[in-house]
Interface confidence: low
Amino acid sequence: AGVFELQIHSFGPGPGPGAPRSPCSARLPCRLFFRVCLKPGLSEEAAESPCALGAALSARGPVYTEQPGAPAPDLPLPDGLLQVPFRDAWPGTFSFIIETWREELGDQIGGPAWSLLARVAGRRRLAAGGPWARDIQRAGAWELRFSYRARCEPPAVGTACTRLCRPRSAPSRCGPGLRPCAPLEDECEAPLVCRAGCSPEHGFCEQPGECRCLEGWTGPLCTVPVSTSSCLSPRGPSSATTGCLVPGPGPCDGNPCANGGSCSETPRSFECTCPRGFYGLRCEVSGVTCADGPCFNGGLCVGGADPDSAYICHCPPGFQGSNCEKRVDRCSLQPCRNGGLCLDLGHALRCRCRAGFAGPRCEHDLDDCAGRACANGGTCVEGGGAHRCSCALGFGGRDCRERADPCAARPCAHGGRCYAHFSGLVCACAPGYMGARCEFPVHPDGASALPAAPPGLRPGDPQRYL
């Protein structure tokens, strides 16, 4: 267990021409707040998909009123960190969405109005316990500067927060076979419950006796480093063998430098030497133009005539990412059977199996659901020799073969329009109503039925208020 921490440093106009208008005015003062959403692995970044690692909401920032005639400055920010607690192992690779929300404080009917000002998203690799990573992201004409880190909550330690530390039972030494717990040298590692020999640094287990590998490591005990840094160039496969093994471990294993940066070890960590057009701790920040040919794998570059304006890569089939540097997620082939969750770790596919299934592709049935097929993503639920299908949203029937229209029950109140959606349904509310099902009137006395949480944050249903 641990906490992901996000510190917003600044939010304001990006460099270059076309500065955005201030989101606030003398007539309509406003304040900002932020939402962060985290997902494990190389998840889809669709805003509607669940924040499986967690989400957090910042406090409101100070009220800001634009000075007439002045350009939009960096806007005043909320105090404090955004903290997202996570219970299980830190996945090492994660996707994030950071949203900047504007709360307008004018005299509009129904109280404060919220609108999404900017949304940035990305995928990053991060070890727990490491230093703050710096980042700059642009969304249209806005620029967001922030830092982030993942830290373990005692008694967990390690790069994935999977090793446990306990106070020493004796003042002088740890028990047989147990090491001191760096950096908590006065504590000792708790006895491992994973498979014997499972790497405490690069493996973890969710059940006794297993050994699951973090990204960049492989083998039955997660002791074999997998590096693509010397095997794949950022513009596609080089002449070197793909997926090759290199000696390790070391801070440059797995190549922490993005965008073709070269990694060199330093006494305490590593240093990235970035190619032209990239900068940042891991070469993750781009100041590149189309003239630099930033789109890999045959991507088409549009815009970006000067370093201060953004470019967009239109990727050919089979590639994705802001620079077309990533192959399409092989999980789209649905290799995990029996409803297993697929993670494309780059060097390998990993399946996280549902309860009752095991095996590299979740092909082994451990329960009395053997031979029971639930269609359309449904899962078989066992119990005392009997079993039934728990169907995915949008499907029903004994074997989940019947398509269910989530809008058939007319769930949107007060004249709201219902739209079927991959995660359920979405209600577009009639004027004067809000809520997941348009069930809340917007009151003329300035109070709304959801007084403080911005739309879409809680509870779980997708909502569209704006």
């Epitope: 989400a55 910042s58 607690p85 909550e153 728990s390 359920g424 509870p459």
Partner: antibody
Framework: QVQLVQSGAEVKKPGASVKVSCKAS????????ITWVRQAPGQGLEWMGD?????????NYNEKFKSRVTMTRDTSTSTVYMELSSLRSEDTAVYYC??????????????WGQGTLVTVSS | EIVLTQSPATLSLSPGERATLSCRAS??????LHWYQQKPGQAPRLLIK???QSISGIPARFSGSGSGTDFTLTISSLEPEDFAVYYC?????????FGGGTKLEIK
């Protein structure tokens, strides 16, 4: 370990206000929503609202109590407060605070306080 | 608001028997349903979250199933300490609501 410790029982007259406290320990206080649930004698559970301690202005109230309930927090003492005003006899109940888990976009309540009995009687 | 209806209101069984408790929602709540156990004089205790996800420290004899509007809590083999009141809760839409409860008593 995670603990939520609530203030002691209260006896109030109709029309008065009561402020119940809930002191949290054993976890990062500002990271988890705290919810308030009440239970009248012999009755079921009723959700009153919740507060995000990382931002004291981030609250959600049950419409039924909205005009009478105020939830606040003091990060220096890791304490959340629930104040209910204009008390009436039907507000006699045990008031619980609970910490909400953070999984996906909706929340269950995994740790509960011991409860505070509030009796409203003239 | 979403109404959760629990049945039966009272269930009389003996230790060792299998208990099946039902919770029906007035509209679809996806998988945002949780189960709690409450004993006299105590705070509720979370048993199952999100229909079927187990909770650390809760015995494996407790399991949940269902989807959409119909949900079930199953106790595979009753122990003496399992006799209590059980509540379901939805966190799919405001306001969050609980079912009326099912009292599980010794026959």
């Amino acid at each position: 370990q995670v603990q939520l410790v609530q203030s002691g029982a209260e006896v109030k007259k109709p029309g008065a206000s009561v402020k119940v406290s809930c002191k949290a320990s054993g976890y990062t206080f500002i990271s988890y929503w705290i919810t308030w649930v009440r239970q009248a004698p012999g009755q079921g559970l009723e959700w009153m609202g919740d507060i995000y301690p990382g931002s004291g202005s981030t609250t959600n109230y049950n419409e039924k109590f909205k005009s009478r309930v105020t939830m606040t927090r003091d990060t220096s003492t890791s304490t959340v407060y629930m104040e209910l005003s204009s008390l009436r006899s039907e507000d006699t109940a045990v008031y619980y605070c609970a910490r909400e888990t953070t999984v996906g976009g909706a929340y269950a309540m995994d740790y509960w306080g011991q409860g505070t009995l509030v009796t409203v009687s003239s | 608001e979403i109404v959760l209806t629990q049945s039966p209101a009272t269930l009389s069984l003996s230790p060792g028997e299998r208990a099946t408790l039902s919770c029906r929602a007035s509209q679809s709540i996806n998988n945002n349903l949780h189960w709690y156990q409450q004993k006299p004089g105590q705070a509720p205790r979370l048993l199952i979250k999100y229909v079927s996800q187990s909770i650390s420290g809760i015995p494996a004899r407790f399991s949940g199933s269902g989807s959409g509007t119909d949900f079930t809590l199953t106790i595979s083999s009753l122990e003496p300490e399992d006799f209590a009141v059980y509540y379901c809760q939805q966190t799919n839409a405001w306001p969050l609501t609980f079912g009326g409860g099912t009292k599980l008593e010794i026959k």
